[in-house]
Interface confidence: medium
């Protein structure tokens, strides 16, 4: 999403339809406090960012409140009065849903139903990954509500689970980000465990697809 203009790379993340984060990497201006100017409507005057992100003492991004907005973000990154990067983006295409909350497990013999609080907006996939120490890689199952039943489990084995939320690509496009994973929880015989013996450390999720 960040083609270079005058050596400026940008990244946009719309956190849970609540906060937009725009960050930039400008090698040419690495020791410069670039300013961020924005508007949500093509007719308005630009506002200047009031919540900058800093890296090594210099501005590197901006956080904007943008609660449940389907808006175009018009923005300009400037060195003094000189614009070094100007663009506009439909924010929703850079959605990153929040991590699943209130994750619960309901066991019935060789199956478990994983539930969590559905987010307030739709067109999402709720993905559960799970593995036992005997599995070489994570298994995955996803549904469009946070109610995912996994069958065919061995009650004697210990399983690690974690959950995340993804935006549906055919609705939001390919430039979204999956949520962070929920905490790993381990279960055996329908009871929670501190850990599953010999389970390798789960791979860190990639930020983007």
């Amino acid at each position: 999403q960040g083609g270079a203009a005058e050596g400026v790379q940008i990244q946009i993340i719309y956190f849970n339809l609540e906060t937009v984060q725009v960050t930039w990497n400008a090698s040419k201006y690495s020791r410069t406090n670039l300013t961020f100017h924005y508007r949500f409507n093509g007719d308005e005057a630009y506002d200047q960012c009031t919540n900058y992100l800093l890296q090594e003492g210099h501005t590197s991004g901006c956080l904007l409140d943008a609660e449940q907005r389907d808006d175009i973000l018009y923005f300009s990154i400037r060195n003094g009065t000189h614009p070094v990067f100007t663009a506009s983006r439909w924010m929703v295409y850079y959605l990153k849903p929040s991590s699943p909350k209130h994750v619960r497990f309901s066991w019935h013999q060789d199956a478990v139903t994983v539930t969590c609080s559905d987010l307030s907006y739709g067109d999402l996939l709720y993905e559960v990954q799970y593995r036992s120490p005997f599995d070489t890689e994570w298994q995955s199952k996803q549904e469009n509500t946070c109610n995912v039943t996994i069958e065919g489990l061995d009650a004697e084995k210990c399983y690690s689970f974690w959950v995340r939320v993804k935006a549906m690509e055919d609705v939001y496009g390919p430039d979204t980000y999956p949520s962070d994973w929920s905490e790993v929880t381990c279960w055996q015989r329908g009871e929670i465990r501190d850990a599953c013996a010999e389970t390798p450390t789960p791979p860190k999720p990639k930020l983007s697809k």
Epitope: G3, I72, T86, G122, P174
Partner: antibody
Amino acid sequence: QVQLVQSGAEVRKPGSSVKVSCKASGGTVSSYAISWVRQAPGQGLEWMGGITPIFGTAKYAQKFQGRVTITADKSTSTAYMELSSLRSEDTAVYYCARGGIAAAGTFDYWGQGTLVTVSS
Amino acid sequence: DIQMTQSPSTLSASVGDRVTITCRASQSISSWLAWYQQKPGKAPKLLIYKASSLESGVPSRFSGSGSGTEFTLTISSLQPDDFATYYCQQYNSYSWTFGQGTKVDIK
């Protein structure tokens, strides 16, 4: 395979309005944005505006602001473009197009076009 | 709005020729540029997006290059099916804007 099928040709008098529809099959209108692009006879392409049906709000090119209304009905997978206060310069082929894969700004599927003729 | 200027407006060429069309943006658009092909009475067809990425199903004789304000569409060996009008389009900043078109006709 996504297909966008538009309503038929229209003839209107100056000052009136026209509403063109665009029905998606093999996919839904909620897939990416749906935009409307027009082309006057022998002229180039002009983006009028677009809508993200998951939210139902539209964005318009400055030139058409106040005269064009773009809507979408998720239940029927249909998008609509209404242009009011028509004048002879609005005679054109109107295309609906689905936003493409790159930042939703390119158009990878197009309707067949609807000719709107404005004449007294 | 960002202005897109294509050159030439008309280009006469023969089958097998290497053809290059240029598109200039009035300000930097990074790589947010697409190219379309349009034949008379038909809707445009997406060829290239993000300046140089080939759309699925488009023949490899089409290629795009450039970034910032200068872009080119190249047809390495013109085929009979390629005689058409070509448009560039920026999608860096709303409103999306198109070039005025380049008509490629038979010499």
